[in-house]
C-alpha cells in the first residue's frame, strides 16, 4: 500500500488568482510517498514546459540525494517523435517508467523497496533537439520507506574487569525500541544509543554487565512488528561461549 | 509559528570575516532549501546564495563567490553564512528566506546588518 | 546574465489599479514571483507563479505574465500598498535574480 502526501501544514501557498496563457518550466512532486520495505512505491512526477508541442529526441532522468548533482538511478531516451522512452539505466533493474515523458509525465515505479531507498528522488528532464532545453525538480519527493523491526547483530563482548556485556543491534522504520530480558533482569530497556548519522534506521541497546549465566534475549518492536533474537552465556575457567 | 531570527552582524574592518547565523522555528527546517539575500543601503535586493536540504548542494552568486560559504545545522536548525574578505560594497542588510517548493521566498527573517568600514 | 527590468517608480491614486511591470528573457521560460518591502521591514511573497496568491494576500493583489514580461497588478489600490514592489525568477539551476525594485507611491 502506497501513502502519497499530497498536502502538509507548513504549506502556506493556496490561492490561485488566474491561469497564465504560456507554460513555464515547473515540475510537480508530492512532497512525500510512503511504502513498506519489500513493496513497490511510484513517485509521481509532471511537468509543465514552454515548448509548444515539442516532438525531439527527450532523456528523461531521476537522481537520488541531491538535486543536479545527486547520483542517477534511472534515465531513459526517447527519439524525435517517439513515446517509446528506451531504458538507459535502471539500478539494480528496481527502476521502470510508468509515465509518458511526451505527455509531461515522468513518474517512476520502485520496486522491492530497501530501507536504504529511503531519501529525496529528483526528477529531469532534457530536450535535445532543435530546442536545447532542460530542467529539474529541486524540491525532489521524499520516499519513506517503513519496515518491521530486524535484528542485524547480537552479541557478547568482553568487558574491563573479567565481566562481560551484550550488544544488540536491530533496523527499522520507525526505529525500533528495544528491551533485554534475561536472568535476573526481567525486561530492562539497557542503554539505548541513538541511531547514528548515516545509519538513521539503526537502534543500538547494550547490556553493560551481564551477572548471570544464562539466556538473555533481546526483543525490538515498533508499530509494524517485532524481532526477538537470543544469546547464550556460559562462564568456565573465566572464559565465555556464545551461541545465537 | 513559522520564523526565521538572524544574528551575527555587526562593524567590521575591510578584509575582515563574519559569520551569521539564521534560526529557524515552526517548521521542519531539513525540507526546504535555504538561501540569503542581501540588501545595501538604499539599493535593491540581491540573491546571495542557496544551500539545499542536506547542504550537499550550494550555489553562490558572482559578486560574494570564493569569499563567503554558506552552510546549515539541521540539528540545531540553523543556517550560517561566513563571510571573508569582506569589501565596502559587502555592507548591507542580510535576511535568510525559506525557499517553499514553488521556486520562491516563502518566509523571510527581520535581517542583520552588516557594515564594512574602516 | 540574467536581468529582469522594473520601472523605477509608479504612482497611483487611491482606489484606482496600479500596473507594475517586470521584462526579461527569463520569463519566457521561467515563472515570475513579486515581493512586496515596506521601509524598515523585510520583504514580503506577495504573488508566485505568475498568477497565484499567498494565503493571507488580499486579494487586490494579482499577477500575469505574457511573453517576456510580468505583470503585477494591484485593483483598489490602499493607502497601506506604497511599497516598493520586486519581481524576480529562477532559473534552471542556481540562478536567482531580482528585479531593480518599483517604488509605488498612492497619491
Known amino acids: 500500500f502506497v501513502r502519497t502526501k499530497i498536502d502538509t501544514t507548513e504549506n502556506l501557498l493556496n490561492t490561485e488568482v488566474h491561469s497564465s496563457p504560456a507554460q513555464r518550466w515547473s515540475m510537480q512532486v508530492p512532497p512525500e510517498v510512503s511504502a513498506e520495505a519489500g513493496d513497490a512505491a511510484v513517485l509521481p512526477c509532471t511537468f509543465t514546459h514552454p515548448h509548444r508541442h515539442y516532438d525531439g529526441p527527450l532523456t528523461a532522468i531521476w537522481r537520488a540525494g541531491e538535486p543536479y548533482a545527486g547520483p542517477q538511478v534511472f534515465r531513459c531516451a526517447a527519439a524525435r517523435g517517439s513515446e517509446l522512452c528506451q531504458t538507459a539505466l535502471s539500478l539494480h533493474g528496481r527502476f521502470r517508467l510508468l509515465g509518458n515523458p511526451r505527455r509531461n509525465d515522468l513518474s517512476l515505479r520502485v520496486e522491492r523497496l530497501a530501507l536504504a531507498d529511503d531519501r529525496r528522488y529528483f526528477c529531469r528532464v532534457e530536450f535535445a533537439g532543435d530546442v536545447h532545453d532542460r530542467y529539474e525538480s529541486r524540491h525532489g519527493v521524499r520516499l519513506h520507506v517503513t519496515a518491521a523491526p530486524r535484528i542485524v547483530n547480537i552479541s557478547v563482548l568482553p568487558s574491563p574487569a573479567h565481566a562481560f556485556r551484550a550488544l544488540c543491534t536491530a533496523e527499522g522504520e520507525p526505529p525500533p525500541a528495544l528491551a533485554w530480558s534475561g536472568p535476573a533482569l526481567g525486561n530492562s530497556l539497557a542503554a539505548v544509543r541513538s541511531p547514528r548519522e548515516g545509519h538513521g534506521h539503526l537502534v543500538t541497546a547494550e547490556l553493560p554487565a551481564l551477572t548471570h549465566d544464562g539466556r538473555y534475549t533481546c526483543t525490538a518492536a515498533n508499530s509494524l512488528g517485532r524481532s526477538e533474537a537470543s544469546v547464550y552465556l556460559f562462564r568456565f575457567h573465566g572464559a565465555s561461549g556464545a551461541s545465537t | 509559528q513559522v520564523q526565521l531570527v538572524e544574528s551575527g552582524g555587526g562593524l567590521v574592518q575591510p578584509g575582515g570575516s563574519l559569520r551569521l547565523s539564521c534560526a529557524a522555528s515552526?517548521?521542519?527546517?531539513?525540507?526546504?532549501?535555504m538561501t540569503w539575500v542581501r540588501q545595501a543601503p538604499g539599493k535593491g535586493l540581491e540573491w546571495v546564495s542557496f544551500?539545499?536540504?542536506?547542504?550537499?548542494?550550494?550555489y553562490y552568486a558572482d559578486s560574494v563567490k570564493g569569499r563567503f560559504t554558506i552552510s546549515r545545522d539541521n540539528s540545531k536548525n540553523t543556517l550560517y553564512l561566513q563571510m571573508n574578505s569582506l569589501r565596502a560594497e559587502d555592507t548591507a542588510v542580510y535576511y535568510c528566506?525559506?525557499?517553499?517548493?514553488?521556486?520562491?521566498?516563502?518566509?523571510w527573517g527581520q535581517g542583520t546588518l552588516v557594515t564594512v568600514s574602516s | 546574465d540574467i536581468e529582469l527590468t522594473q520601472p523605477p517608480s509608479v504612482s497611483v491614486a487611491p482606489g484606482q489599479t496600479a500596473r507594475i511591470s517586470c521584462s526579461g528573457d527569463?520569463?519566457?521560460?521561467?515563472?515570475a514571483s513579486w515581493y512586496q518591502q515596506k521601509p524598515g521591514q523585510a520583504p514580503v511573497l506577495v504573488i508566485y507563479?505568475?498568477?497565484k496568491r499567498p494565503s493571507g494576500i488580499p486579494e487586490r493583489f494579482s499577477g500575469s505574465n505574457s511573453g517576456n514580461t510580468a505583470t503585477l497588478t494591484i485593483s483598489g489600490t490602499q493607502a497601506e500598498d506604497e511599497a516598493d514592489y520586486y519581481c524576480?525568477?529562477?532559473?534552471?539551476?542556481?540562478?536567482?535574480?531580482f528585479g531593480g525594485g518599483t517604488k509605488l507611491t498612492v497619491l
Open positions: 527569463a520569463l519566457r521560460s521561467y515563472y
Open positions: 524576480a525568477s529562477f532559473t534552471y539551476m542556481s540562478d536567482f535574480v
Open positions: 528566506a525559506r525557499e517553499g517548493t514553488s521556486s520562491m521566498f516563502d518566509v
Open positions: 515552526g517548521f521542519t527546517f531539513s525540507n526546504y532549501w
Open positions: 544551500i539545499s536540504y542536506s547542504g550537499s548542494t550550494t
Open positions: 507563479d505568475d498568477n
